[in-house]
């Protein structure tokens, strides 16, 4: 089968109430079939590529475990399995200040060096 291209799928928006939790869905495809090398998953807020990171985790070669390196205020937790092309993120104890746009990103290292980030992101509406 032909190699897949990089793509990311996120919904335009997610709505939730302050104090509740929300899930920011993000799935991706990539051209590196059977990739099992080092992987980093990142979520940032505000703007793509340059916005501040709110979550980051890293998985070692051959591992499905994406070890959390950053979770802003301890409120961000990865639900998706990056090895299954899913970066879905759970945000706990929502505050009005969380009402912004969020962007998911995945990075491959090791034998393959490649990365991809959602351009449009998902808008989180907190009411």
């Amino acid at each position: 089968s032909p190699a897949q291209r990089w793509s990311m799928q996120v919904p335009p928006e997610v709505s939730a109430e302050a104090g509740d939790a929300a899930v920011l869905p993000c799935t991706f495809t990539h051209p590196h079939r059977h990739y099992d090398g080092p992987l980093t998953a990142i979520w940032r807020a505000g703007e793509p590529y340059a916005g501040p990171q709110v979550f980051r985790c890293a998985a070692a070669r051959g591992s499905e475990l994406c070890q959390t390196a950053l979770s802003l205020h301890g409120r961000f937790r990865l639900l998706g399995n990056p090895r299954r092309n899913d970066l879905s993120l759970r945000v706990e104890r929502l505050a009005l200040a969380d009402d912004r746009r969020y962007f998911c990103r995945v990075e491959f290292a090791g034998d393959v060096h490649d990365r991809y980030e959602s351009r449009h992101g998902v808008r989180l509406h907190v009411t």
Partner: antibody
Framework: QVQLVQSGAEVKKPGASVKVSCKAS????????VSWVRQAPGQGLEWMGV????????GYNEKFKARVTITADTSTSTAYMELSSLRSEDTAVYYC??????????????WGQGTLVTVSS | DIVMTQSPDSLAVSLGERATINCKAS??????VDWYQQKPGQSPKLLIY???NRYTGVPDRFTGSGSGTDFTLTISSLQAEDVAVYYC?????????FGQGTKVEIK
């Protein structure tokens, strides 16, 4: 050949802790994730958490996060699962399982024989 | 957490007949479902991974299918040694979650 050999059955009182071991052989222990899965009597399977022995990184099911600690000793190729504040509902067979992979697919390819933990006053 | 619901809970099939077990996920889990067989007093054993891939040494009478939310394990011609409980498991989301199990018996 790959083998996971677990420690023997345990009887514990409510409120106590238990530590179950899982000794691996036949493969390079630090490279593969090891998960712990439990099965209450006559019930289904429940994933508790995972460790990557090479890095020592762990991930837990939120249900158990406050009470479970998973560790690994690469010098002896042994993974451990410690569960604290035991209650009667923790009576179960506890399994370790290797998370093998093939061409970018992960799966539980080898399981320990199971360790029965009985919690009773 | 993702809920995996198997049907039926138990199944009695004549030797040589087909057995079909269904597994429904509470949300889309792609093709990230494995099937495990557990015989009485034994540890689970891997049958199928990634929905359709038969694990090494597993007889070809075992077939997996499905994606998204609906998955099926089929035993095309039931043998006596297939008496066991069968579990589906999703690994698309953490925590990994299993179905409640389907007990397969001989009619």
């Amino acid at each position: 050949q790959v083998q996971l050999v677990q420690s023997g059955a345990e009887v514990k009182k409510p409120g106590a802790s238990v530590k179950v071991s899982c000794k691996a052989s036949g493969y390079t222990f630090p490279r593969y994730d090891v998960s712990w899965v439990r099965q209450a009597p006559g019930q289904g399977l429940e994933w508790m958490g995972v460790i990557h022995p090479g890095s020592g990184g762990t991930g837990y099911n939120e249900k158990f996060k406050a009470r479970v600690t998973i560790t690994a000793d690469t010098s002896t190729s042994t993974a451990y699962m410690e569960l604290s504040s035991l209650r009667s509902e923790d009576t179960a067979v506890y399994y370790c399982a290797r998370r093998g992979l093939n061409k970018g697919y992960w799966f539980f390819d080898f399981w320990g024989q199971g360790t029965l933990v009985t919690v009773s006053s | 957490d993702i809920v995996m619901t198997q049907s039926p809970d138990s199944l009695a099939v004549s030797l040589g007949e087909r057995a079909t077990i269904n597994c429904k996920a509470s949300q889309n889990v792609g093709s990230n479902v494995d099937w495990y067989q557990q015989k009485p007093g034994q540890s689970p054993k891997l049958l199928i991974y990634e929905s359709t891939n038969r694990y090494t040494g597993v007889p070809d009478r075992f077939t997996g299918s499905g994606s998204g939310t609906d998955f099926t394990l089929t035993i095309s011609s039931l043998q006596a040694e297939d008496v066991a409980v069968y579990y589906c498991m999703q690994s698309n989301f953490f925590p990994f979650t299993f179905g409640q199990g389907t007990k397969v018996e001989i009619k």
